[in-house]
Interface confidence: low
């Protein structure tokens, strides 16, 4: 039978595919349609009266390769509505009345490549809405009311085209969003509510590192008021996110480097693009002599292409290779002689191999921030025995182990913020007996192994914006005997018996050691309450009457899943203290 082709719809065959046109036929239910069996077809139900898609509505349409549901009044899609559409490649559901894309909305569409859902009223996209769409390349969501996107929404989605125009987005973080859209060819972001503050620095840097011809339309600031109407790409990083007060050695804790730009060495093979570097803070007297001295430019052979170099007195080189599209350290040729500081921030380095840094044994500072490093081969830093500062912030690291840091006997500062670190193995920091400052904020940590800080002379530790619900004092925090500053805020603290130890430990520290308030997330009645202000009896009823009850587990393995709300609120609350970009 020819199904609806003989009655309701107009059908024609083209290149072996049936085109079934049921546009503007007053159809109220998908079940009114029947199609010829066993041949691929495209179905258009454009401009009808559909208001809801019910479970199994399309189960009789198994050979559909394209379905157009645009310009209906669909307000809800039941779970399983698309069952049976395993061959579907294109789904158009634009100009409807959808308000939410649920976890199971697109269940059954495992071959979908193109999804058009613009001009609805979408405000919420649930965290796994697209997770099964492992072939989706084109996603059109413009002209909805999306205020934020859940973390990892596109983790398993190979998007090449994403249209987010005309929504209510204020920021797009790197971790959980930008990191997952590396294949993107076309990203449209105009007409949103972009808040041009520190939170947007990650997006700005990411856009700058994309091929210059790829972004269509400008990201225009909506707030703060003095930036309203300004184009993000034209704003200086330091005006969007002023660097905090100058810390020791005139470097801020987020790792932004205050360095003077040097002109390119005269070499026709070199990139002509000069890299803009964060301006010097005015109160950095220690750097002024260095800046005002005329810079000694080196002859070509000594400065690796595509970098700029500067001689640091009395000897040694500052090598500036920031934002030069470098994929591997082996791209730096010829290897420099006597390098002292090597800045490779904002490149596209994916991995670091044992052989990459063998010739750099004179380095005192290495900046690898804002790359894409996932793999750090054990022993990569083995030769860097003079290194004092290592920046690995803004990469894709997920696990830390002892082998990664072998050789770093003199390291004092280690910046690991804004990665996706979930696990730190026992003994990780043992190869660094001089480590004073450790930044691990904005990662995915839930636990720390016992004795992780044992024998490490840390004075500053930043564990802010992770996934800690508990943190044992015994064998972890009580090893921090030289501590002058610890950041623990913005974690989903579970204010129950297991946190009594932490509360007591905090109360013993001197006033300014804990930088900000530690707020409870659970249980519900203590949400947003300050830990230090709570009575121990509230945290752990009956504690006083049961003095033998242990208040700490030495290595508490937290099994609570990092819920999406937590993740959205914590890991992906973007930079409030400036991403190190330089």
């Amino acid at each position: 039978s020819r199904g609806s082709c003989d009655s309701l719809c107009n059908c024609e065959e083209k290149d072996g595919t049936m085109l079934i046109n049921c546009e503007a036929k007053g159809i109220k239910m998908v079940s009114e349609i029947s199609v010829p069996p066993s041949r691929p077809f495209q179905l258009s139900l454009l401009n009808n009266g559909l208001t809801m898609l019910h479970t199994n509505d399309f189960s009789g349409l198994t050979n559909a390769i394209s379905i157009h549901l645009g310009f209906n009044n669909i307000a809800d899609i039941e779970i399983g509505a698309f069952n049976g559409l395993g061959l579907l490649k294109q789904l158009h559901i634009n100009h409807n009345s959808l308000e939410i894309l649920k976890e199971d909305t697109f269940h059954g569409l495992e071959n979908l490549e193109f999804l058009q859902a613009d001009n609805n009223f979408i405000t919420v996209i649930e965290p796994s809405a697209f997770s099964k769409l492992n072939r989706l390349k084109v996603l059109i969501l413009n002209d909805n009311a999306i205020e934020s996107l859940p973390p990892n929404i596109f983790r398993f989605v190979p998007l090449t085209h994403l249209d987010l125009r005309g929504n209510q987005l204020q920021t797009l973080p790197y971790v959980g969003f930008l990191e997952h859209i590396g294949r993107i060819l076309d990203l449209q972001l105009e007409d949103n509510k972009w808040a041009c503050n520190c939170d947007l620095l990650q997006l700005k840097t990411w856009l700058e590192n994309m091929p210059p011809q790829s972004i269509i339309g400008d990201v225009v600031c909506n707030s703060p008021p003095f930036f309203k109407g300004s184009i993000l790409s034209r704003l200086k990083k330091e005006s969007i996110c002023p660097t905090p007060p100058v810390y020791e050695e005139h470097e801020d804790p987020s790792g932004s480097l205050h360095l003077a730009a040097t002109s390119s060495i005269n070499d026709s093979r070199m990139s002509t693009k000069t890299t803009s570097i964060l301006k010097l803070p005015t109160k950095a007297p220690g750097l002024i002599p260095y800046i005002t001295k005329p810079s000694t430019q080196l002859p070509g052979p000594y400065c690796p292409i595509p970098c700029n170099c500067k001689v640091l007195s009395p000897s040694g080189l500052l090598i500036h290779c920031q934002e030069r599209n470098i994929e591997s350290l082996s791209d730096l040729r010829p290897p420099p002689q006597n390098p002292r500081k090597l800045i490779l921030a904002g490149n596209i380095i994916h991995s670091l191999m044992k052989s990459d840094l063998v010739e750099y044994f004179t380095l005192e500072m290495l900046h690898l921030g804002n790359n894409r490093i996932e793999v750090l081969e054990e022993g990569s830093f083995m030769n860097l025995t003079r290194l004092q500062k290592l920046y690995l912030n803004g990469n894709h690291l997920t696990k830390l182990s002892k082998g990664m840091f072998l050789g770093l006997h003199n390291l004092e500062y280690l910046y690991l913020e804004y990665n996706a670190i979930k696990e730190i193995l026992p003994g990780t920091f043992n190869p660094m007996p001089k480590l004073k400052v450790l930044y691990l904020n904005n990662n995915l940590l839930q636990v720390l192994p016992p004795h992780i800080f044992s024998g490490v002379p840390l004075t500053k530790v930043n564990l802010k914006t992770n996934q800690f619900t508990h943190l044992p004092v015994s064998n972890i925090l009580d090893d921090l005997d030289l501590l002058t500053q610890i950041d623990l805020e913005d974690n989903p603290w579970d204010c129950s018996c297991d946190l009594v130890g932490l509360q007591q430990w905090i109360q013993k520290l001197s006033k300014n050691t804990v930088t900000d308030d530690i707020l409870c997330t659970s249980p519900g009645h203590l949400d947003k309450k300050e830990l230090k202000a709570l009575n121990s009896e509230i945290l752990c009823p009956g504690l006083v009457n049961n003095p033998s009850m242990p208040t700490q587990t030495s290595y508490l393995m937290v099994t609570t899943p990092a819920t999406t709300t937590n993740t959205a609120d914590t890991i992906l609350r973007s930079l409030t203290d400036a991403v190190p970009l330089s």
């Epitope: 090449t160 590396g182 294949r183 993107i184 091929p211 210059p212 011809q213 269509i216 599209n325 596209i348």
Partner: antibody
Framework: QVQLVQSGAEVKKPGASVKVSCKAS????????MHWVRQAPGQGLEWMGI????????SYAQKFQGRVTMTRDTSTSTVYMELSSLRSEDTAVYYC??????????WGQGTLVTVSA | EIVMTQSPGTLSLSPGERATLSCRAS??????LAWYQQRPGQAPRLLIY???NRATGIPARFSGSGSGTDFTLTVSSLEPEDFAVYYC?????????FGGGTTVEIK
């Protein structure tokens, strides 16, 4: 100056495949997308697809999906377009063109592909 | 896909005259439209992008206007080398599509 140099003319039989190359010079190869556009004799221009030379990701026009493959070799700054299952209506001049916000600011000289039994 | 329609198909004019070419989109493409010139035996050349911006090295006699669905390319005073085929192209949505072309020939 920017130059896109394409491979020479090809004559193919129906059902065969053709692979056209486009060598870029005068700019940073991985910083600009490359598109392929074709023009049948006496006809207009038809966009075929795009490749990102940096990562290698591609997107093809629906019409060519399954028949076209675009690849690149960053070591030689060359992109390739392979079209399979050729039919007579694929006879055309094939151009590579550098992407400039989805417009085309530099074009190759074109490669004539003739499909004839 | 967005269909681009150019008119007229052919325009017969003399050197020094003003040429006005039209391009219409089947749906709004905002300002995201380009014009190309193609001389016989050559590859196309970008003239105008984003409806009204002249590409590098394009003489001032070429200008573009319009937004939404209706666009115009104007050549204020035709030079001998301007007799060619002109195409419009939208970049508002994928796939990228061209108009069928307008031939400007010598009268």
């Amino acid at each position: 100056q920017v130059q896109l140099v394409q491979s020479g003319a090809e004559v193919k039989k129906p059902g065969a495949s053709v692979k056209v190359s486009c060598k870029a010079s005068g700019y940073t190869f991985t910083s600009y997308y490359m598109h392929w556009v074709r023009q049948a004799p006496g006809q207009g221009l038809e966009w075929m697809g795009i490749i990102n030379p940096s990562g290698g990701s591609t997107s093809y026009a629906q019409k060519f999906q399954g028949r076209v493959t675009m690849t690149r070799d960053t070591s030689t700054s060359t992109v390739y377009m392979e079209l399979s299952s050729l039919r007579s209506e694929d006879t055309a001049v094939y151009y590579c063109a550098r992407g400039f916000t989805r417009y085309f600011d530099y074009w190759g000289q074109g490669t004539l592909v003739t499909v004839s039994a | 896909e967005i269909v681009m329609t150019q008119s007229p198909g052919t325009l017969s004019l003399s050197p020094g005259e003003r040429a006005t070419l039209s391009c219409r989109a089947s749906q709004s493409v905002s300002k995201y439209l380009a014009w190309y010139q193609q001389r016989p035996g050559q590859a196309p050349r970008l003239l105008i992008y984003d409806a009204s911006n002249r590409a590098t090295g394009i003489p001032a006699r070429f200008s573009g206007s319009g937004s939404g669905t209706d666009f115009t390319l104007t050549v204020s005073s035709l030079e001998p080398e301007d007799f060619a085929v002109y195409y419009c192209q939208q970049r508002y949505n994928w796939p990228l599509t061209f108009g069928g072309g307008t031939t400007v020939e010598i009268k």
